[in-house]
């Protein structure tokens, strides 16, 4: 019963985690404009892995995709790759774990096969969670580096009096979603691995020997516990705008009070 609960909980936690990783990957708020010096701004910038957005005080939001692949920073590409790998592994892990669930009966699948699949999905969830945490952490590190670099050059004098303010970016909501989601996926994976141990049938290749000593009855089993991981020969393996003068009709921006484009 405890094994089923652990496995089921691990599955649910991992499912929530992977949904969070997908959400974080799709979110536009990976980095948001730092508002420390100006809490109320007329133009607010935020960026995601796939596009950057500008929300005006008027309520209009305009988002632009990164249509270049080669022109993007290597770090951003690496973060994208880590998140996608995390999602793919997580999705496969979910698929495997569905069949591994003790509460689901599929033909005459043995417990050893279910244990094997539970462990496989658990490892996949762990790697998926680590990929997400790594991706988010790499991006966060990139932000911190850029933040202090832009703080050093915050105001660049142009002809004495004129000042150009460099936009600084800080952690966006997606980073926190990613960290939490990665952590949940990781925890779910660990729970699946724990559940795998309970699912695995105990093998006893010996006879129990009883020793009787002065009034006490003690049973002694030599050899200790042997858990079948299912990777032996006895297992049955079962096999996601430009410049220039323009009229307003040429401008594509959308009002966004309720949702962000």
């Amino acid at each position: 019963m405890a094994v089923t609960a652990c496995q089921g909980l691990g599955f649910v936690v991992s499912l929530i985690g992977i949904a969070g990783i997908i959400a974080a990957t799709c979110m536009d708020q990976w980095s948001t404009q730092d508002l420390y010096n100006n809490p109320v701004t007329a133009v607010f910038n935020y960026q995601g892995l796939w596009r950057s957005c500008v929300r005006e005080s008027s309520g209009f939001t305009e988002c632009r995709g990164y249509f270049t692949l080669l022109g993007l920073p290597a770090m951003l590409q690496a973060v994208r790759a880590l998140m996608i790998v995390g999602i793919v592994l997580g999705a496969i892990g979910l698929l495997v774990s569905i069949f591994a669930l003790k509460c689901i009966r599929i033909g005459s699948m043995e417990d050893s096969a279910k244990a094997n699949m539970t462990l496989t999905s658990g490892i996949m969830f762990i790697v998926s969670g680590l990929c997400a945490i790594a991706g988010v952490s790499v991006f966060a590190n990139m932000l911190v580096t850029n933040f202090w670099m832009s703080t050093a050059n915050m105001y660049t004098g142009m002809g004495g009096m004129v000042q150009t303010v460099q936009t600084r970016y800080t952690f966006g909501a997606a980073l926190f979603v990613g960290w939490v989601a990665g952590g949940l996926t990781l925890i779910g994976g660990v729970m699946m691995c724990i559940a795998c141990r309970g699912l695995a049938p105990e093998e006893t290749n010996y006879k129990a020997v009883s020793y009787h000593a002065s009034g006490h009855s003690v049973a002694y089993k030599p050899g200790g516990f042997k858990a079948s991981t299912g990777f032996g020969s006895n297992t049955k393996n079962k096999k996601i705008y430009d410049g220039g003068a323009r009229t307003e009709d040429e401008v594509q921006s959308y009002p966004s009070k309720h949702d962000y484009v």
Partner: antibody
Framework: QVQLVQSGAEVKKPGASVKVSCKAS????????MNWVKQAPGQGLEWIGN????????SYNQKFKGRVTLTIDKSTSTVYMELSSLRSEDTAVYYC???????????WGQGTTVTVSS | DIVMTQSPDSLAVSLGERATMNCKSS????????????LTWYQQKPGQPPKLLIY???TRKSGVPDRFTGSGSGTDFTLTISSLQAEDVAVYYC?????????FGGGTKVEIK
């Protein structure tokens, strides 16, 4: 069509308060921020502040903060600007204006003249 | 606060001639997020509220004649009336829409020579 209709001219004594209204029609009232602009006689334009009719959030020019209050009545699609502790330099035409792309003001009310005189 | 400085204060141009006025901001109005300049131009005729001509420094509002052209980037901006008409006699204001408080220039008065 979009229309912003403001209340009539007001004459007030120094130290008093004035509440100017701006009724919007012809568009989704909660979809656009409303701004207030002051124009003293023979002078230029001065931004007072704005209000988001959807959330009710406000932004004020520090120069007017503490003396000006912007409020809304969604049921009548009306925005109000209340200016307290009036002084002679508050004598001006006050405009309400709808905020558009680029934070520009695309539609303006006809203006309300407020005269502060003892 | 961003200070907007307009020049000249007044401008007398013959009908059909080109009228050019400038606007300088104390800080860049170019937003790095979308590479747009948050500068707006308005026209105000006596006894009337201002009328929006150009936003994002160069985008004409629909219904505005194409003789009105906005240009510039960063801190220096220009409004050009390619062929002045009698109805263009007015005061023209530029506005910072990038940073609060939103600020206006002192205005340029355009008259017929």
């Amino acid at each position: 069509q979009v229309q912003l209709v403001q209340s009539g001219a007001e004459v007030k004594k120094p130290g008093a308060s004035v509440k100017v209204s701006c009724k919007a029609s012809g568009y989704s009232f909660t979809g656009y921020n409303m701004n207030w602009v002051k124009q003293a006689p023979g002078q230029g334009l001065e931004w007072i502040g704005n209000i988001d009719p959807y959330y009710g959030g406000t932004s004020y020019n520090q120069k007017f903060k503490g003396r000006v209050t912007l409020t809304i009545d969604k049921s009548t699609s009306t925005v109000y600007m209340e200016l307290s502790s009036l002084r002679s330099e508050d004598t001006a035409v006050y405009y309400c204006a709808r905020m558009y792309h680029g934070n520009a003001f695309d539609y303006w009310g006809q203006g309300t003249t407020v005269t502060v005189s003892s | 606060d961003i200070v907007m400085t307009q020049s000249p204060d007044s401008l007398a141009v013959s009908l059909g001639e080109r009228a050019t006025m400038n606007c300088k901001s104390s800080q860049s109005l170019l937003n790095s997020g979308n590479l747009k300049n948050y500068l707006t131009w308005y026209q105000q005729k006596p006894g009337q509220p201002p009328k929006l001509l150009i936003y994002w420094a160069s985008t004409r509002k629909s219904g505005v004649p194409d003789r009105f052209t906005g240009s510039g980037s960063g801190t220096d901006f220009t409004l050009t009336i390619s062929s002045l008409q009698a109805e263009d006699v007015a005061v023209y204001y530029c506005q910072n829409d990038y940073s609060y408080p939103l600020t206006f220039g002192g205005g340029t008065k355009v008259e017929i020579k």
